[in-house]
Every structure is written in C-alpha cells, then in structure tokens.
C-alpha cells in the first residue's frame, strides 16, 4: 500500500505541515506523517538511511494492527508467521510451517495430519460409505432369461473420502453368482435387462455369499466387515470351486 506523505506547505510551527496529504493528521517536511487520521495505521518506512512516517489503511503483510487511544500502529508478526491478527494468532504461516489454532508448528500434533496444500494441521478423516443398495437383477450377458446361472451386483456410495492418513474405503461394488428359474426367452425378450426373476434357493454346495476380492482387501486398510482369515479363504476355494467371487472396487 502506498502511503501519502506530507507536502511542503505553510507551517503551523517549525517542521510541522498543516495540510498533510492523504491519511496523515499531522506531518513534517523531514519525517513525513507524525500521526494518522482515525482507522489508519502509523508505520515507519525506511528510505535509504532515513525513516519516514506513513499512514496505512491496513497493515502490510507480516504485520498486524494494534489500537491505542492516540495512535494505531503496525507491529511485526512472529518470525514463522506470514499474516496474523496478533503475535499469538497467526492466520498464515511461513513456508515449512503448519498452522494449527493460530500457531505455526514444524509438525502436526498427534491425531492430526499435515495438509500440504493449505499448510494446516487438519483432522484425520476416515472413509465413510453408505449402506449397500439392493442387489441388481440376476443376469447373464445382459439378459434375465435363457440361463440357469448368472451374476448379480450391488453397490454403495462413498459419503466421505478419506484424508491421507485416514482409513481407506472398503469395496463399493460386490458381485456374486446367482441362479434363476431356467426360462426360455420369449420373442422380443432376448437381451432385455432389469426384469427380476424369482430366484431358486441355492443348491447344496452353492453359496450366495459375496466374498470381496482378496486383492482389493489387501490394498485397503482392515475394516471389521472386510476381514477374512486367509486360511479360511484357501480352504473355501478348495472345498468348492463353484464358490461365488466378488468383483470389488476399492477407492
């Protein structure tokens, strides 16, 4: 902000100008502003070896305003702080520091993580997902007729994406094998999707349980509903190769 300086004018008494420029209330030829109009801040500006008084509408970056009955002045923020309301309340830290509750920190406290975009310490946010949507109709190659075994899918939405240190999201897609009443497609019905058929109860040794894809489990952080003993998985695969397998998407 450029501040106005006192013009050389008729003097009220030695060295003090009467008609000061801009925001100066009183000024001198040699020292510039000596005092400021209301709501303006007095600051000293160095010009060569000389310090000139200036009146500013707001303090420059790195300084904060303090009010006194006779003068409002600009004071430097702490060394690690770029902008502040006062020395105890920083609003933007210098590079390499993280802002937390008005303070500039080298590292974020326990339970918080550094956001390198905003340079703030923020709460760790864990993934949140919705309830599963209903299973889709049992289909095979997009058809709901003309087959015995098909697949059905269900999905759920991510309500809250996790932050860097947050728990990853569990699978949001699940697919399982299903059986339908064997039925020939009627004329014009071939290829139609979405007509739900009554499903037969699973045959012995045939399961409708959806097992999340083990790869997707390994890539996500353990969440109780996802946890499955690896030995149990192997055992299950050996026992029944027909076992349904889920195609899961991890975010």
């Amino acid at each position: 902000q450029n501040a106005s300086r006192g013009r050389r004018q008729r003097r009220m008494h030695p060295n003090v100008s009467q008609g000061c420029q801009g925001g100066c209330a009183t000024c001198s030829d040699y020292n510039g502003c000596l005092s400021c109009k209301p709501r303006l801040f007095f600051a000293l500006e160095r010009i060569g070896m000389k310090q000139i008084g200036v009146c500013l509408s707001s303090c420059p970056s790195g300084y904060y305003g303090t009010r006194y009955p006779d003068i409002n002045k600009c004071t430097k923020c702490k060394a690690d702080c770029d902008t502040c309301f006062n020395k105890n309340f920083c609003t933007k830290c210098k590079s390499g520091f993280y802002l937390h509750l008005g303070k500039c920190l080298d590292n974020c406290p326990e339970g918080l993580e550094a956001n390198n975009h905003t340079m703030e310490c923020v709460s760790i946010v864990h993934c949140e997902v919705s309830e599963w949507n209903p299973w889709s109709p049992c289909t095979k190659k997009g058809k709901t007729c003309g087959f015995k075994r098909g697949t059905e899918t269900r999905v759920r939405e991510i309500i809250q994406h996790p932050s860097a240190k947050g728990n990853l999201c569990p699978p949001t897609n699940e697919t399982r094998k299903c059986t339908v009443q064997r039925k020939k497609c009627q004329k014009g019905e071939r290829g139609k999707k979405g007509r739900e058929r009554k499903r037969k109860k699973p045959n012995k040794g045939e399961s409708k349980e959806a097992i999340p894809d083990s790869k997707s489990l390994e890539s996500s952080k353990e969440i109780p509903e996802q946890r499955e003993n690896k030995q149990q998985q192997k055992k299950r695969k050996v026992q029944d190769k027909q076992k349904s397998v889920s195609v899961s998407t991890v975010h």
């Epitope: 709501r39 305003g65 303090t66 009010r67 006194y68 309340f89 509750l101």
Partner: antibody
Framework: QVQLVQSGAEVKKPGASVKVSCKAS????????IHWVRQAPGQGLEWIGY????????GYNQKFKNRVTMTRDTSTSTAYMELSRLRSEDTAVYYC??????????WGQGTTLTVSS | DIQMTQSPSSLSASVGDRVTITCKAS??????????MNWYQQKPGKAPKLLIY???NLESGVPSRFSGSGSGTDFTLTISPVQAEDFATYYC?????????FGAGTKLELK
Amino acid sequence: QVQLVQSGAEVKKPGASVKVSCKASGYTFTDYSIHWVRQAPGQGLEWIGYIYPSNGDSGYNQKFKNRVTMTRDTSTSTAYMELSRLRSEDTAVYYCATYFANNFDYWGQGTTLTVSS
Amino acid sequence: DIQMTQSPSSLSASVGDRVTITCKASQSVDYDGDSYMNWYQQKPGKAPKLLIYAASNLESGVPSRFSGSGSGTDFTLTISPVQAEDFATYYCQQSNEDPLTFGAGTKLELK
C-alpha cells in the same frame, strides 16, 4: 459511514445448507477481515471464523471447520458464509463484523436462521 | 480454548448507580504489554456494539461513564453512573488466541 447489510431470514430443513451474505460499504472492502459470529436464541455469542477479502484466505473455529465455507466477491464488496449439514442447534442469528486491530467495531444487522423439520 | 467467565450473569440497578461486571479468562490474554480484551453492549434484537477495546480504551462515541480495567486474566467493566439507556447485556471477548471467545454475558436490569 461504514455499513454491513446482511441478507434476509432463512428457514431450512435439517441436512440442508444455507448461504448468508454481508454487503459492505463506506470503506475499502479489502482493508479489513470480515468475521462471522452467531447467537442462538437467548444465548451468548459464538465466533465462527473469518475471511480476508483482499486474498480470500479464511480460517474457521474448529467446531465449524468441516461445515463452514467463507467466500467473498470483491466486485460487489460482499462476504458470504455458507453452513452445510444444518441441524436444529444451528438455529441462531448470524452476524458479520469488521475486525479492526483485534476488535469487532462494525456489525451487520444479523440474519435469522431457523432449522426445523 | 480460552474460557471467559463473566459474573454476575445478571444484576439489577437503578439509574445513577455504579455497577461493576467482571470477566475472568482461563489463561492470560496479555501479550507484549497489550491486553487483548474487549467489551460489548447488546440490546434486544440488535447487534453488539463495541464499548471498550484493549481492556481499558474507550471506543469513539462511547460515553465516558463506561470504563474498563484489568490485565492478564482478570478484567472489569464499570458503568457509573448508570443511565436508562444502559440497561442491556454486556459481553467480554478475548482476541489473543484462536478461537476468539466471548463470555456468556451479564444482563443489567432495572431494579
């Protein structure tokens, strides 16, 4: 003279969002930070956060951090405060105020928000 | 957070009385010799109005019957003599640290 004029009363359902405006006049909008303070019926004052109109930098009370967003439009000298995922406890009068050297010296007239199903 | 405890929560006075409201901060609100404490007056249905800044400085246009004192954690607002237009709620507020916090208020009522 300095004036802050706020938008009118709002009635919202729980889970909805509200955006309150605060139009400044009588001074250079970018000179002072604008803060938002609320007051629940019959209660005291609670600070929500601030925005620097000069560059748009903002900071919020931790209590509101995940639900509040403060923005500004320098062309119209207007500050905005948006509160999301509203609940009945957010029913209050919301004030904007200029912050001059560590005190709130000018206030808007207040915007009444009622959150009810 | 710095907690601001105001007392009393309400008091009754007559025109001409001297009243004192106190505010105690849970930790010092002073820094570099400055006290970051303000006092506001609020009337029903109106926005708060700044009375005292930096603990003891009278805001421009505020009558001299209002005065503030204190430092560190203990602060006082005094009104003497009380006038009819002074019946309102008074709040202290610290601006030393994030988050900025207010006292719960003191309601001054007509006896």
